[in-house]
């Protein structure tokens, strides 16, 4: 008798979330910084929520959070939450340091 092959698809809530920062976690003021919420999820994440160090939700819901021009006041810890049809997951905190530059201060 011929055997049938079955594929079992496992659905799971977002996991292993992390915030990556480009060009890095230390950015000179006036430049741009992009925070990306990376995750493993099935089905893929359908909705992202971003939070700052006060656990205040930010008005951004895409996978990438772009800050341009970045300001020293943007410095702090950020985390993201990913949601799919199965559930939610959250990342650890990642710290962004936006630093003063003598050049930009001199142009003020």
């Amino acid at each position: 008798t011929a055997s049938k092959a079955w594929t079992l698809e496992v659905l799971y809530a977002p996991r292993r979330l992390r915030v990556s920062m480009s060009p890095g976690d230390q950015v000179m003021e006036g430049k741009s910084a992009t925070l990306t919420c990376e995750s493993d999820a099935n089905p893929p994440v359908s909705h992202y929520t971003w939070f700052d160090w006060n656990n205040q939700s930010l008005p951004y819901h895409s996978q990438k959070l772009r800050l341009e021009p970045v300001k020293v006041q943007h410095s702090g810890a950020y985390w993201c939450q990913g949601t799919n049809s199965v559930g939610k997951g959250r990342s650890p905190l990642s710290t962004l340091t936006v630093y003063y530059s003598p050049e930009t201060i001199g142009r003020r």
Partner: nanobody, 121 residues
């Protein structure tokens, strides 16, 4: 309490050199952006040089090509090598450190004595 202690200042003739040190007491020194500032009598504090954890550096136009900022993460020290010194470099020099939104010294704080650099002509 985290401390920053500057040293290495002194009296030097124009054209001479000095190396300033900023010794920091935080265990995670390598994660901090480090700054050197200076304040001349009757003037506002001025940012001179910046170095990131990854040794990216930036300088004020007035010191470019003459001053070099560096760091030794193993010793938790930031340096300012000052060459071709000019009388207008005379000031008290201070360091500062930043991680995220935390500055070890805030602008309203008493920044202490710093280290005095005097350049005579």
């Amino acid at each position: 309490q985290v401390q920053l202690v500057e040293s290495g200042g002194g009296l030097v003739q124009a054209g001479g050199s000095l190396r300033l040190s900023c010794a920091a007491s935080m265990s995670s020194f390598s994660q901090y952006v480090m700054y050197w500032y200076r304040q001349a009598p009757g003037k506002q504090r001025e940012l001179v040089a910046t170095i990131t954890s990854y040794s990216n550096t930036n300088y004020a136009d007035s010191v470019k090509g003459r001053f070099t900022i560096s760091r030794d993460n193993a010793k938790s020290i930031a340096y300012l090598q000052m060459d071709s010194l000019k009388p207008e470099d005379t000031a008290v020099y201070y360091c500062n450190a930043q991680y995220g939104s935390t500055f070890i010294r805030n602008h309203w704080d008493d920044w202490g004595q710093g280290t005095q650099v005097t350049v005579s002509s």
